[in-house]
């Protein structure tokens, strides 16, 4: 009998909402044993998969995908699923990043420019918190965000 | 808003030993909680950290010698699974969050002291 | 892994005098990387998060710059309130053995 799969988690690092410019990682986590971590958009056509699947405790895998320049597109909900033989498992709750416009960030004119890419697999950490303090002590001009429907 | 860490105690090595950390005036249910060592004249060492969805991060060191679980809107713990001599420190518990990062730490308690000696 | 290194471990500088420390990290953390002061029996206090945003109530005395890989703490006008041990923090990401640089003990003559 196939075993019922637990549903993953999300988290980013440092976390959900970030400096335009700064890098943020995604972290998914599920059971051992998993193949493949995926790492959706809203729309599920939208996504990136990877088999570099760590683990996280005795019961647990994680994968990180990291974004190395986040831009206003890439502000928006974002879930995990995984591919754990012979099967996959349900969707993660959604994580809502944010993307803060502020000065002073790496990409700012007295600084080096940085690179720049979509998700690309690497790592980071915070997780769909619904009840999270709103970004107390921001120093923010603008909050790019992206409306959804669940 | 405040952070207090049980009263430290000096224990023999190898006795598994639970730290208690305790807020006032707001609910750990709405932020990340970390805790902090320091051994007796050196710098701040990270253990680890428990997310609102009950995920727990660790040091590379400390994975497998010390487990953080909420154990209610107001409690968390650090559990020494096995203590050497040199996990004697004050122990310090942190709150992340702020500013929506996870583990930027912006309230501490006071610290406690734990000794580990034969 | 990442690694935080801190440096001097220790400074001597005079009342009105100026201070500087700084902190290399290991690989690029952005501008995720904040200062904590700790003076002896208490625990650590945030100065500056996001590499140069002052802390709310925390004199502009101390000022942080930096990204990607190096920051400086600087603190002029020194007063002797300010005699204590100086710590950089990364919070880009948990794969490390320590979030924290080794620290920077300042003394004021």
């Known amino acids: 009998q196939e075993e019922d799969l637990p549903r993953p988690s999300i988290s980013a690092e440092p976390g959900t909402v970030i400096p335009l410019g700064s890098h943020v990682t995604f972290v998914c986590r599920g059971p051992v044993g998993v193949q493949t971590f995926r790492l959706e958009r809203e729309s599920r056509s939208t996504y990136n998969d990877t088999e570099d699947v760590s683990q996280a405790s005795p019961s647990e895998s994680e994968a990180r995908f990291r974004i190395d320049s986040v831009s206003e597109g890439n502000a928006g909900p974002y879930r995990c699923i995984y591919y754990k033989p012979p099967k996959w498992s349900e969707q993660s709750d959604y994580l809502e990043l944010l993307v803060k416009e502020t000065s002073g960030g790496p990409d700012s004119p007295d600084t080096e420019p940085g690179s720049s890419a979509g998700p690309t697999q690497r790592p980071s950490d915070n997780s769909h918190n619904e009840h999270a303090p709103a970004s107390q002590g921001l120093k923010a001009e603008h909050l790019y965000h992206h409306h959804h429907h669940h | 808003q405040s952070l207090q860490e049980s009263r430290g105690r000096l224990v023999t090595p190898g006795t598994p030993l639970t730290l208690t950390c305790t807020a006032s005036?707001?609910?750990?249910?709405?932020?990340?909680m970390g805790w902090v060592r320091q051994a007796p004249g050196k710098g701040l060492e990270w253990i680890g950290y428990?997310?609102?969805?009950?995920?727990t991060w660790y040091a590379n060191w400390a994975k497998g010698r010390f487990t953080i679980s909420k154990t209610s809107s107001t409690t968390v713990n650090l559990r020494m699974t096995s203590p050497t001599t040199e996990d004697t420190a004050t122990y310090f518990c942190?709150?992340?969050?702020?500013?929506?990062?996870?583990?930027?730490?912006?309230?501490w308690g006071p610290g406690t002291l734990v000794t580990v000696s034969s | 892994e990442l690694v935080m290194t801190q440096t001097p471990a220790s400074v001597s500088e005079p009342v009105g005098g100026t201070v500087t420390i700084n902190c290399q990290a290991s690989?690029?953390?952005?501008?995720?990387l904040a200062w904590y002061q700790q003076k002896p029996g208490q625990p650590p206090k945030l100065l500056i998060y996001?590499?140069?945003t002052l802390e709310s109530g925390v004199p502009s005395r101390f000022s942080g710059s930096g990204s990607r890989t190096q920051f400086t703490l600087t603190i002029s006008d020194l007063e002797c309130a300010d005699a204590a041990t100086y710590y950089c923090?990364?919070?880009?990401?948990?794969?490390?053995?320590?979030?924290f640089g080794g620290g920077t003990e300042v003394e004021i003559k």
């Open positions: 996001d590499a140069s």
């Open positions: 428990i997310h609102t969805n009950r995920n």
């Open positions: 690989e690029d953390i952005s501008i995720y």
């Open positions: 923090q990364q919070y880009s990401t948990t794969d490390t053995n320590n979030l």
């Open positions: 005036g707001f609910s750990l249910s709405s932020y990340h």
């Open positions: 942190a709150r992340g969050s702020y500013g929506d990062y996870n583990f930027l730490f912006d309230v």
